[in-house]
Interface confidence: low
Amino acid sequence: HNTTVFQGVAGQSLQVSCPYDSMKHWGRRKAWCRQLGEKGPCQRVVSTHNLWLLSFLRRWNGSTAITDDTLGGTLTITLRNLQPHDAGLYQCQSLHGSEADTLRKVLVEVLADPLDHRDAGDLWFPGESESFEDAHVEHSISRSLLEGEIPFPPTS
């Protein structure tokens, strides 16, 4: 199995998709596990509903959710509020009895938050000058500033 890289931004959600042959894996529950070391075991994080027919229902374990489109053959894992410690190797698995087939090996990479809200100065880049216009260019988006929110941090 090749490893597929999924990149997410810290503090945001990351969706990981694992396609599979829906006929081959018909009736099988799925799981998402974290690889412990290069040749270590894969520690279960979350698995789909105990009743295979209800696999489409999202199941959570902490900040990780799993849902399975058994007809279309796509397992989807959502990592909510992604954090640096979430980075690492994972597997999507198809379960049968006590065995597990690997559907996809996944490397999760966590990129820094574009705005570190703990420190307004700790940005990817801190400066905003007059050449940066506070203009909404996408008409479908309208957003009002919250009380006390500064649209652009001042350059220090």
Partner: antibody
Framework: EVQLVESGGGLVQPGGSLRLSCAGS????????MSWVRQAPGKGLEWVSV??????????GYNPSVKGRFTISRDNSKNTLYLQMNSLRAEDTAVYYC?????????WGQGTLVTVSS | DIVMTQTPLSLPVTPGEPASISCQSS???????????LNWYLQKPGQSPQLLIY???TRASGVPDRFSGSGSGTDFTLKISRVEAEDVGVYYC?????????FGQGTKVEIK
């Protein structure tokens, strides 16, 4: 794998218009600032424009050299970045790169050549 | 605008030997948060630029450890500990402190 693919370049007369596109894949497009950087033939790099991410209202910024003539935008449903270039001048002749912006321009497209000439 | 000045503009190198490029900014790029907003890029012949170093000294993902960045608020250096043939191209420094982002004029590194 992060990929950026530009298109839309070509030959245009001074005063004319052109719209460049950049299709992004392999990352959550709405989470990232996106930018355009250009390079005149045989010259160095010049930053052109930036558009912020969803969390920051998709606001836009421009280099004073293009402000009022160029407009950056994005269609997030298509994971595509655009640069609308109006009132083009000979000095706008360059390869235009779209780039994802994090700690720096961390991923670049292959570039598309814009030639402004009569 | 912050002006970025690179020296030398051309640098002939010998594979296996070290190389050094300097960059100077017209304003300090040291932010009050302690980070210095200076980046280095390499544009190999016929290719798009690639990010090498950010925050003056942090290597970007996948960049070999023979590349290192150092400096102060206004004077910066990119060092290659042992030049390899694949390192040829034009190196650019860039300030990321304020808009408009500006680049140095580039340093062309070529094998002697």
């Amino acid at each position: 794998e992060v990929q950026l693919v530009e298109s839309g370049g070509g030959l245009v007369q001074p005063g004319g218009s052109l719209r460049l596109s950049c299709a992004g894949s392999g990352f959550t497009f709405t989470d990232f600032y996106m930018s355009w950087v250009r390079q005149a033939p045989g010259k160095g790099l010049e930053w052109v424009s930036v558009i912020r991410n969803k969390a920051n209202g998709y606001t836009a910024g421009y280099n004073p050299s293009v402000k009022g003539r160029f407009t950056i935008s994005r269609d997030n449903s298509k994971n595509t970045l655009y640069l609308q270039m109006n009132s083009l001048r000979a000095e706008d002749t360059a390869v235009y790169y779209c780039a994802r912006l994090t700690y720096g321009f961390d991923y670049w497209g292959q570039g598309t050549l814009v030639t402004v000439s009569s | 605008d912050i002006v970025m000045t690179q020296t030398p503009l051309s640098l002939p190198v010998t594979p296996g030997e070290p190389a050094s490029i300097s960059c100077q900014s017209s304003k300090s790029l040291l932010h009050s948060n302690g980070k210095t907003y200076l980046n280095w890029y390499l544009q190999k012949p016929g290719q798009s630029p690639q990010l090498l170093i950010y925050w003056m000294s942090t290597r970007a993902s996948g960049v070999p450890d023979r590349f290192s960045g150092s400096g102060s608020g206004t004077d910066f250096t990119l060092k290659i500990s042992r030049v390899e043939a694949e390192d040829v191209g034009v190196y650019y420094c860039q300030q990321f402190l304020e808009y408009p982002f500006t680049f140095g004029q580039g340093t062309k590194v070529e094998i002697k």
